[in-house]
Interface confidence: medium
């Protein structure tokens, strides 16, 4: 789509908007029970995946002047990951218990893993349209952080001096997982 100049995402505080009657929001529904194991269970940096909840989010996107013509569906990676040893029959046996006890100053968080880029069209207050290229989350993973680690926020990409885009959510859960840029 042709787009006039290089619009930067620009936002105002927005209130949630009602869901479109035809949209099916499945927010807060954990996928596959929310438990995802890595192949070996031994790559303790990123691929030990237990209790990483993947919540389905359906929301409208707004940049202040425009809102998406249809809801955006993506995953929200939520919460902390449970330590593996609390589960029965863990592949690592007793070793895992020592491993976790030695690392009590660390925690595992559910973070974005896989993403994909898609175009989304917004309708604007002056009756025109605008197209953005956005990155949506398609899978989550557990990642280990030390207590002192400053977790990198999974916010929108900063794009010059503009404020982040706002999401009109169809339900309650906030998401800061999509990255947005102009196409």
């Amino acid at each position: 789509f042709k787009n006039d100049a290089t619009e930067i995402l620009y936002s105002h505080v927005v209130k949630p908007v009602p869901a479109h009657p035809s949209s099916n929001s499945t927010l807060n529904q954990a996928r596959n029970g929310g438990r995802h194991f890595s192949n070996t269970g031994l790559d303790r940096n990123t691929r030990v995946q237990v209790g990483c909840r993947e919540l389905r989010s359906t929301k409208y996107i707004s940049d202040g002047q425009c809102t998406s013509i249809s809801p955006l569906k993506e995953l929200v990676c939520a919460g902390e990951c449970l330590p593996l040893p609390v589960l029965p029959n863990w592949i690592g046996g007793g070793y895992g218990t020592k491993y976790w006890s030695r690392r009590s100053s660390q925690e595992w968080r559910c973070v974005n893993d896989k993403t994909r880029t898609q175009r989304i069209q917004l309708q604007c207050q002056d009756g025109s349209t605008r197209t953005y290229k956005i990155t949506v989350v398609t899978a989550c993973k557990c990642k280990r952080y030390t207590r002192q680690h400053n977790e990198s926020s999974h916010n929108f990409e900063s794009m010059s001096p503009a404020k982040p885009v706002q999401h009109h959510r169809e339900r309650k859960r906030a998401s800061k997982s999509s990255k947005h840029s102009m196409s």
Epitope: D4, I8, I69, C124
Partner: antibody, heavy 121, light 112 residues
Framework: QVQLVQSGAEVKKPGASVKVSCKAS????????MSWVRQAPGQGLEWMGW????????TYADDFKGRFVFSLDTSVSTAYLQINSLKAEDTAVYYC??????????????WGQGTLVTVSS | DVVMTQSPLSLPVTLGQPASISCRSS???????????LHWYLQKPGQSPQLLIY???NRFSGVPDRFSGSGSGTDFTLKISRVEAEDVGVYFC?????????FGGGTKVEIK
């Protein structure tokens, strides 16, 4: 070519309701938002708000929250403005309007012919 | 909301002579992306408004080149190099940088 054709003039009594229609043609209706603009007799233009024609989500300017309702019938490419509990000060010409293709901020290029709503006892 | 103030309210002009209308906004209309969303409309008697100039200085298709726009920040001007009879009507400036979209009060151009 893009056309926005509005319903005819209405005369209503205070307290009544009125529904103005705006039928769009010449483009894909659900791709472009629809704005509504009010012009009281001999006065300037007031932007009332707009409706996302795909999602049906309306946005109202502060002065038009409450009694004013934007709606759609996408099957006939028509946007509606309903005004409830009419007051004498609602007497005005109401325009539906649309912007240009893929050019945000390039002005409102397409306007309906306007619908005069007169509220009088 | 951004308040748009136009002057003069009324502008009597002579055919073939230039005319100028001013529009001032209560806050800067320059967007963080560098664009300035200031537009000019003409409403001829008994008609709907029509777009003349968009984004300060861009003429909309079919608009004669005797119309030109200029300005930045909060001060903008619409100029007609040589007024013709068909130019009579009310001219409005409008901004869409900020939400909500707002219009000026209008300037009535009439032939002397």
């Amino acid at each position: 070519q893009v056309q926005l054709v509005q319903s005819g003039a209405e005369v209503k009594k205070p307290g009544a309701s009125v529904k103005v229609s705006c039928k769009a043609s010449g483009y894909t209706f659900t791709t472009y938002g629809m704005s509504w603009v009010r012009q009281a007799p001999g006065q300037g233009l007031e932007w009332m708000g707009w409706i996302n024609t795909y999602s049906g989500v309306p946005t109202y300017a502060d002065d038009f929250k409450g009694r004013f309702v934007f709606s759609l019938d996408t099957s006939v490419s028509t946007a509606y403005l309903q005004i409830n509990s009419l007051k004498a000060e609602d007497t005005a010409v109401y325009y539906c309007a649309r912007g240009r293709e893929y050019y945000y901020g390039s002005g409102i290029a397409f306007w309906g012919q306007g619908t005069l709503v007169t509220v009088s006892s | 909301d951004v308040v748009m103030t136009q002057s003069p309210l009324s502008l009597p002009v002579t055919l073939g002579q230039p005319a100028s209308i001013s529009c001032r906004s209560s806050q800067s209309l320059e967007h963080s992306n560098g664009n300035t969303y200031l537009h000019w409309y003409l409403q001829k008697p008994g008609q709907s408004p029509q777009l003349l100039i968009y984004k300060v200085s861009n003429r909309f298709s079919g608009v004669p080149d005797r119309f030109s726009g200029s300005g930045s920040g909060t001060d903008f001007t619409l100029k007609i190099s040589r007024v013709e009879a068909e130019d009579v009507g009310v001219y409005f400036c409008s901004q869409s940088t900020h939400v909500p979209l707002t219009f000026g009060g209008g300037t009535k151009v009439e032939i002397k």
